[in-house]
């Protein structure tokens, strides 16, 4: 019963949390103009990962994508990739872990593939999650970059030097909206993977071998349950997510230091 | 299209509040407009006043601040500008206008001369 | 607040000719979000309330002739009338839109010579 609630609450959580990373991939306000010095001001901008926003005092708001490619910065085709990515890992580990949950019947699939499904859904999570809070966390590390490289710009009119302060960005809702998201997702996943312990009866994972001796009925089982589940010293199995970051060296199609445990 | 129409009194005594109503017709004033006050003082230039949002938020300009309070009657489809402890100087012609895009102000109501004298 | 500076006060033209009206705000008008300039340009005729001419400093408002124009950036702006009409006569206000409080450019007032 406490597996069956562990997995259905790490589903819930991680439902809410990717539709949370859509939302926040999909919001404007990943950036909001600084109004520090002007808490009212007549135009006030705003920007996504898609489009930039101006919000004038009389109430007229105008949209502008960002209708090149090319010409966006790096970071911000990094944050994309790293939201977009986490909401396809996410989607497909919803769709995984519906089939997997225990509450739900299709066939007859046994404990030990709804087990693997569901921890497949928790890494799926798990991964989901940490590419949010990633892409966020880059996101807001480049907010906090350009606000002190912002300081007094100068504009010069054909009477002379007229001084503007040039206009600095804060954290949007998005960010905040992005972290929760991520770390929703990333207990969720968590979840699953608690849940799958639960989820593969001893019986059902290995054969028990009797052994019959002269006046007595013994059953001895060998490995017990660390040898077939893959939580214990299976090597195969152990490696269940690199979190670490990469150089771009790093990155090789064969084998690196990364993908042995 | 929006339509705007000024009332008051004409004549009003120092130290004491003017109180005019601009009448919206033609649209809604919680609409997505900034609803605002403005005055041109007799052969001079105009002077903005403040303004209530259609979520009826408002913003004064710093220099009459301590004296105006702008109001809305959505029932009636109506504002108000009520300015306190006038002078000679307040003497002009009120207008109410609404602002939108480029925050320009796009309609003008005729405009209400109001005189300060005792 | 920002300063709004037109000039001339007064303008006598003759019909059919080009009018310029000048107009200098003490700080930009220009909002980097969307690189367009906050300034707005009215005409005001005789008895009657201001009309709305430009926004944006060079976007017309709709039924305005395509004689007026406006163009400019930062802080310094112009309002072309290309070919003086007889109904242009009327007083001319600049506006900054950009930063409270909304503040306007004393008139410039354009005549027939």
């Known amino acids: 019963m406490a597996v069956t609630a562990c997995q259905g609450l790490g589903f819930v959580v991680s439902l809410i949390g990717i539709a949370g990373i859509i939302a926040a991939t999909c919001m404007d306000q990943w950036s909001t103009q600084d109004l520090y010095n002007n808490p009212v001001t007549a135009v006030f901008n705003y920007q996504g990962l898609w489009r930039s926003c101006v919000r004038e005092s009389s109430g007229f708001t105008e949209c502008r994508g960002y209708f090149t490619l090319l010409g966006l910065p790096a970071m911000l085709q990094a944050v994309r990739a790293l939201m977009i990515v986490g909401i396809v890992l996410g989607a497909i580990g919803l769709l995984v872990s519906i089939f997997a949950l225990k509450c739900i019947r299709i066939g007859s699939m046994e404990d030990s593939a709804k087990a693997n499904m569901t921890l497949t859904s928790g890494i799926m999570f798990i991964v989901s999650g940490l590419c949010a809070i990633a892409g966020v966390s880059v996101f807001a590390n480049m907010l906090v970059t350009n606000f002190w490289m912002s300081t007094a710009n100068m504009y010069t009119g054909m009477g002379g030097m007229v001084q503007t302060v040039q206009t600095r960005y804060t954290f949007g809702a998005a960010l905040f909206v992005g972290w929760v998201a991520g770390g929703l997702t990333l207990i969720g996943g968590v979840m699953m993977c608690i849940a799958c312990r639960g989820l593969a009866p001893e019986e059902t994972n290995y054969k028990a071998v009797s052994y019959h001796a002269s006046g007595h009925s013994v059953a001895y089982k060998p490995g017990g349950f660390k040898a077939s589940t893959g939580f214990g010293s299976n090597t195969k199995n152990k490696k269940i997510y690199d979190g670490g970051a990469r150089t771009e060296d790093e990155v090789q199609s064969y084998p690196s230091k990364h993908d042995y445990v | 299209q929006v339509q705007l129409q000024e009332s008051g009194p004409g004549l009003v005594k120092p130290s004491e509040t003017l109180s005019l109503t601009c009448t919206v017709s033609g649209g809604s004033i919680s609409s997505n407009y900034a609803w605002n006050w403005i005055r041109q003082p007799p052969g001079k230039g105009l002077e903005w006043i403040g303004y209530?949002?259609?979520?009826?938020?408002?913003n004064y300009n710093p220099s009459l601040k301590s004296r105006v309070t702008i109001s809305r009657d959505t029932s009636k489809n109506q504002f108000s500008l009520k300015l306190s402890s006038v002078t000679a100087a307040d003497t002009a012609v009120y207008y109410c206008a609404t602002s939108y895009y480029g925050n320009s102000f796009i309609y003008w109501g005729q405009g209400t001369l109001v005189t300060v004298s005792s | 607040d920002i300063v709004m500076t037109q000039s001339p006060d007064s303008l006598a033209v003759s019909l059919g000719e080009r009018a310029t009206i000048n107009c200098k705000s003490s700080?930009?008008?220009?909002?980097?979000?969307?690189?367009?300039?906050?300034l707005t340009w009215y005409q005001q005729k005789p008895g009657q309330p201001p009309k709305l001419l430009i926004y944006w400093a060079s976007t017309r408002e709709s039924g305005v002739p395509d004689r007026f124009s406006g163009s400019g950036s930062g802080t310094d702006f112009t309002l072309t009338i290309s070919s003086l009409q007889a109904e242009d006569v009327a007083v001319y206000y600049c506006q900054n839109a950009y930063s409270f409080p909304w503040t306007f450019g004393q008139g410039t007032k354009v005549e027939i010579k």
């Open positions: 209530i949002y259609y979520s009826g938020n408002t």
């Open positions: 700080q930009s008008l220009l909002n980097s979000g969307n690189q367009k300039n906050y």
